[in-house]
Interface confidence: low
């Protein structure tokens, strides 16, 4: 018979013959022949292969280096790589999460719009009129100015984006 030129899914062509690929979690030991099936072996501990494959070596699991601020988010299996994330207060510098940097703080005059996560940095926003932030923080939002009126007081000093208003007693009319 004419040798195949196209193999089905999960097969590969070798020596004019279609052989089965090794399933995820296993590596190729030997190609199939006219008389034998493809021979595959499971990946060892700390190794993985995540696709149907004909790889002769499994990949090493990623190492989450604590010196780079990394820790294990999800332990790898024979079919999946280890997923690293960053220690509290830090976030990944890339999608691959190969290293971490400290979450940025929002300066006075700016508040936290979105608190940082393991993969994204703090998002700051300028405090709008009526709000202030007098600290550098990775958590604090802009606070509304104190309402002097509700305390039966009057504004003695206007607020800014960095300072609260200063309230004081109302002037009494002297007789």
């Amino acid at each position: 018979p004419e040798p195949p030129t196209a193999c089905r899914e999960k097969q590969y062509l070798i020596n004019s013959q279609c052989c089965s690929l090794c399933q995820p979690g296993q590596k190729l030991v030997s190609d199939c022949t006219e008389f034998t099936e493809t021979e595959c072996l499971p990946c060892g501990e700390s190794e993985f292969l995540d696709t149907w494959n004909r790889e002769t070596h499994c990949h090493q699991h990623k190492y989450c280096d604590p010196n780079l601020g990394l820790r294990v988010q999800q332990k790898g299996t024979s079919e999946t790589d280890t997923i690293c994330t960053c220690e509290e207060g830090w976030h990944c510098t890339s999608e691959a999460c190969e290293s971490c940097v400290l979450h940025r703080s929002c300066s006075p005059g700016f508040g936290v719009k979105q608190i940082a996560t393991g993969v994204s940095d703090t998002i700051c926003e300028p405090c709008p009129v009526g709000f202030f932030s007098n600290v550098s923080s990775a958590f604090e939002k802009c606070h509304p100015w104190t309402s002097c009126e509700t305390k039966d007081l009057v504004v003695q000093q206007a607020g800014t984006n960095k300072t609260d208003v200063v309230c004081g007693p109302q002037d009494r009319l002297r007789a």
Partner: antibody, heavy 118, light 106 residues
């Protein structure tokens, strides 16, 4: 890995069409199968055929009498030739790599639009 | 050849809405694969081996099915999901695609 199609924008009916796919970032003789797919006006996709890294080919039976896929390994290019074209062959032509490990086309060119008209 | 029929051909969904589209094969297939295509771009790998998400695909997407009946589901529609989705099989030659489901945002 990047794929880039090139060829004429316009071909006359009954002539032959020749398109080139230039691959960068991966050798077409290393592994995988390298395909041509076209998309007609109205967006229907049709698989045309492929050349395997070993050089063997496989074509859609609907095109078998008119199609040829070849390659130039020194330039890391593969080619589509379609004979006796008609207006029905007007389409956007894509080249793509099929990754059997995931069973999908993992890299595509941006496509080249061909019009068949006299 | 195996014919893949996608339905509906067109649908629109509001943000947050659950969306399901189907792909029916004329004969049984082992796996179904899905691509997303936005206007003026090439198709992107989206779901492979029926239910596995390609790299970078949001977790709100899922795929399921077996035999002749397969589906793609979005748990909560977002504006960026508006696109045309194609199913594809290669359990038998020739490789075939469905005609696509065009999904728009309301």
């Amino acid at each position: 890995v990047q794929l880039q199609e090139s060829g004429p924008d316009l071909v006359k009916p009954s002539q032959s069409l020749s398109l080139t796919c230039t691959v960068t970032g991966y050798s077409i003789t290393s592994d995988y199968s390298w395909h041509w797919i076209r998309q007609f006006p109205g967006n229907k996709l049709e698989w045309m055929g492929y050349i395997y890294y070993s050089g063997s080919t496989n074509y859609n039976p609907s095109l078998k009498s008119r199609i040829s896929i070849t390659r130039d390994t020194s330039k890391n290019q593969f080619f589509l030739q379609l004979n006796s074209v008609t207006t029905e062959d007007s389409a956007t032509y894509f080249c793509a790599r099929f990754y059997y490990g995931y069973s999908f086309f993992d890299y595509w060119g941006q496509g080249t639009t061909l019009t068949v008209s006299s | 050849q195996i014919v893949l029929t996608q339905s509906p051909a067109f649908m629109s969904a509001s943000p947050g809405e659950k969306v399901t589209m189907t792909c029916s094969a004329s004969s049984s297939v082992s796996y179904m694969h899905w691509y997303q295509q936005k206007s003026g771009t090439s198709p992107k790998r989206w779901i492979y081996d029926t239910s596995k998400l390609a790299s970078g695909v949001p977790a709100r997407f899922s795929g399921s099915g077996s035999g002749t009946s397969y589906s793609l589901t979005i748990s909560s529609m977002e504006a960026e999901d508006a696109a045309t989705y194609y199913c594809q099989q290669w359990s038998s030659n020739p490789l075939t695609f469905g005609a696509g489901t065009k999904l728009e945002i309301k």
